[in-house]
Amino acid sequence: VEDEKPKVNQKLYMCVCEGLSCGNEDHCEGQQCFSSLSINDGFHVYQKGCFQVYEQGKMTCKTPPSPGQAVECCQGDWCNRNITAQLPTKGKSFPGTQNFHLE
């Protein structure tokens, strides 16, 4: 039997887009959707959008949440509509994370 290598899913999904990176758009199309929460100068910043580059989404979505940032990812049309990212509760320890840039 030939060893069939799995192929990465290249399907594009429609995602809710909310936040500064969205401009005037309320949706975007990408390989994954996300909902994120970060703390910027003491303020909670919520964003929703999409990753057009598969590897960017894959890396960002595997990053564990930290006290300053959390991101939840999904695949499916409008799948991030009812997702709100949550920061980890106090008392739990999480490894550090890096910021991600959004296009």
Epitope: P6, K62, Q98, E103
Partner: antibody, heavy 119, light 107 residues
Framework: EVQLQQSGAELVRPGASVRLSCTAS????????MHWVKQRPEQGLEWIGW????????KYAPNFQDKATITAVTSSNTAYLQLSSLTSEDSAIYYC????????????WGQGTSVTVSS | DIQMTQSPASQSASLGESVTFTCLAS??????LAWYQQKPGKSPQLLIY???SLADGVPSRFSGSGSGTKFSFKISSLQAEDFASYYC?????????FGGGTKLEIK
């Protein structure tokens, strides 16, 4: 300090297979995508593919789909590249590199492994 | 596949001069572009990511610009250690592709 240590040079016969290794230190490969790149003498760079060591997912350039197999063993923090049905066209230096959310690009590279295919 | 056309293929310059290389993508890639330096017998080293951002530890005489399909890479005030080969790479769509490289030689 981040380092990628690759296995030594290989001299192999046409038609044979070879497996190259890339052992990481200073970071956990589960937190990155591990890539392989080919460079033939006096030529440019060709991207072969990547593996996500956390879940085993792989992605290959079409030209290498039937030539290369990328694997990883997280317990030893090592990524592997297996090349099959070798011909003289496969004689090259092969580099491993990591891709993280620091830069969303390949920020650290191994020193390269020379593969020579000759009878 | 996205084709990356890099020019010039080679260039001669003197110490202290400035040089600029260009990379053209066959389709728009946003700012998903990196520039690498490679010296003979060595592995590539990341200089620029996201088209314009300088990687940690890279001297400020290196800079990148552009977005979409046209990108530039500049070295101002060339130092002896800058004579090497330089490659652009798009990371927008797999297969990730490299430009053909520019070999920078001392005049």
């Amino acid at each position: 300090e981040v380092q990628l240590q690759q296995s030594g040079a290989e001299l192999v016969r046409p038609g044979a297979s070879v497996r190259l290794s890339c052992t990481a230190s200073g970071f956990n490969i589960k937190d990155s995508l591990m890539h392989w790149v080919k460079q033939r003498p006096e030529q440019g760079l060709e991207w072969i593919g990547w593996i996500d060591p956390e879940d085993g997912e792989t992605k290959y350039a079409p030209n290498f789909q039937d030539k290369a197999t990328i694997t990883a063993v997280t317990s030893s923090n090592t990524a592997y590249l297996q090349l099959s049905s070798l011909t003289s066209e496969d004689s090259a230096i092969y580099y491993c590199a990591r891709y993280t959310s620091d830069y969303y690009t390949m920020d650290y590279w191994g020193q390269g492994t020379s593969v020579t295919v000759s009878s | 596949d996205i084709q990356m056309t890099q020019s010039p293929a080679s260039q001669s310059a003197s110490l202290g001069e400035s040089v600029t290389f260009t990379c053209l993508a066959s389709q728009t890639i946003g700012t998903w572009l990196a520039w690498y330096q490679q010296k003979p017998g060595k592995s590539p080293q990341l200089l620029i990511y996201a088209a314009t951002s300088l990687a940690d530890g890279v001297p400020s005489r290196f800079s990148g610009s552009g977005s979409g399909t046209k990108f530039s890479f500049k070295i101002s005030s060339l130092q002896a250690e800058d004579f090497a080969s330089y490659y652009c790479q798009q990371l927008y769509s797999t297969p990730w592709t490299f430009g053909g490289g520019t070999k920078l030689e001392i005049k």
